[in-house]
Interface confidence: medium
């Protein structure tokens, strides 16, 4: 088992909103849960966009999930990752 490296980034979206993206990379096996949470509970699927779980060329995999949130509410959102029985939570950078 190779645990993922998780990285959260933010980018400007429409006025008053930002897009936050959570990337998991270099993990094996390929089964992974990656989702955005607000106040600790998962957002609905229709408010998130997922990338495919793809091989990254090193025998491991990568994927991402993104969502759009209101600027100023970043602290309420975290990226939740679960892989091979381990989980971690990652904040939106300031």
């Amino acid at each position: 088992t190779v645990p993922p490296m998780v990285n959260v980034t933010r980018s400007e979206a429409s006025e008053g909103n930002i897009t936050v993206t959570c990337r998991a990379s270099s993990f094996y096996p390929r089964n992974i849960i990656l989702t955005w949470r607000q106040d600790g509970v998962s957002l609905s699927a229709d408010t998130q966009q997922w990338g495919d779980v793809l091989p990254d060329g090193n025998g491991t995999y990568q994927t991402w999930v993104a969502t759009r949130i209101c600027r100023g509410e970043e602290q309420r959102f975290t990226c939740y990752m679960e892989h091979s029985g381990n989980h971690s939570t990652h904040p939106v950078p300031s």
């Epitope: 609905s44 975290t78 939570t89 904040p91």
Partner: antibody
């Protein structure tokens, strides 16, 4: 389930500040959201704010943003709430409570501390 | 803020009776993820509140099956099928779908 042990009763003067603690044990502290709640004698409960112990991220009830400040010390698995510029309206029991998002996928205040009575009086 | 209104304020019961407690929210409390985070708590005198029901109808661990929750949208009910002495106290409903999270004013269940 684990335990949440709150600090003892406080008698403070108007205008002062008080820092309440909530020491936890028996669960992985950094995985958890901890909320603080207020209950005046004979009244209902008010949610003040939560803090995510893993990151220190917070979300406040706007009513308390100027009054409360939440922090955690992961080395001692303790959550803190500092309450400032106290008035007699702040006399209440304050509870810490742990959310249970993993075990039940959405129970807010699953486990509670015993409460700390704060009395504000000149 | 979402206003949670509980009725009745006081509910006198005889042991063994069924009790029905009502909670109404001032707006729909479906979270943006589709779940309804409506909970019920029991607080006995001098004690911290205890979670009974989460997500409208799910009993929390260790809660007896005489407690059941139901409802949707803005109207919710907690039923106690056969009231026991240990069930006496103040029951609060709570919504965790919209910040700030809010509690109802409580219903006191007491002996008739």
């Amino acid at each position: 389930q684990g335990q949440m042990q709150q600090s003892g009763a406080e008698l403070v003067k108007p205008g002062a500040s008080v820092k309440l603690s909530c020491k936890t044990s028996g669960f992985t502290f950094s995985d958890n959201y901890i909320s603080w709640l207020k209950q005046k004698p004979g009244q209902s409960l008010e949610w003040i704010a939560w803090i995510y112990a893993g990151t220190g991220g917070t979300s406040y009830n706007q009513k308390f943003t100027a009054k409360a400040q939440l922090t955690v010390d992961t080395s001692s698995s303790t959550a803190y709430m500092q309450f400032s510029s106290l008035t007699t309206e702040d006399s209440a029991i304050y509870y810490c409570a742990r959310h249970d998002y993993y075990g039940t996928s959405g129970a807010w205040f699953a486990y509670w501390g015993q409460g700390t009575l704060v009395t504000v009086s000149a | 803020d979402v206003l949670m209104t509980q009725t009745p304020l006081s509910l006198p019961v005889s042991l063994g009776d069924q009790a029905s407690l009502s909670c109404r929210s001032s707006q729909n409390i479906v979270h943006i993820n589709g779940n309804t985070y409506l909970e019920w708590y029991l607080q006995k005198p001098g004690q911290s509140p205890k979670l009974l029901i989460y997500k409208v109808s799910n009993r929390f661990s260790g809660v007896p099956d005489r407690f059941s929750g139901s409802g949707s949208g803005t109207d919710f009910t907690l039923k106690i099928s056969r009231v026991e002495a240990e069930d006496l106290g103040v029951y609060y409903c709570f919504q965790g779908s919209h910040v700030p999270w809010t509690f109802g004013g409580g219903t006191k269940v007491e002996i008739k």
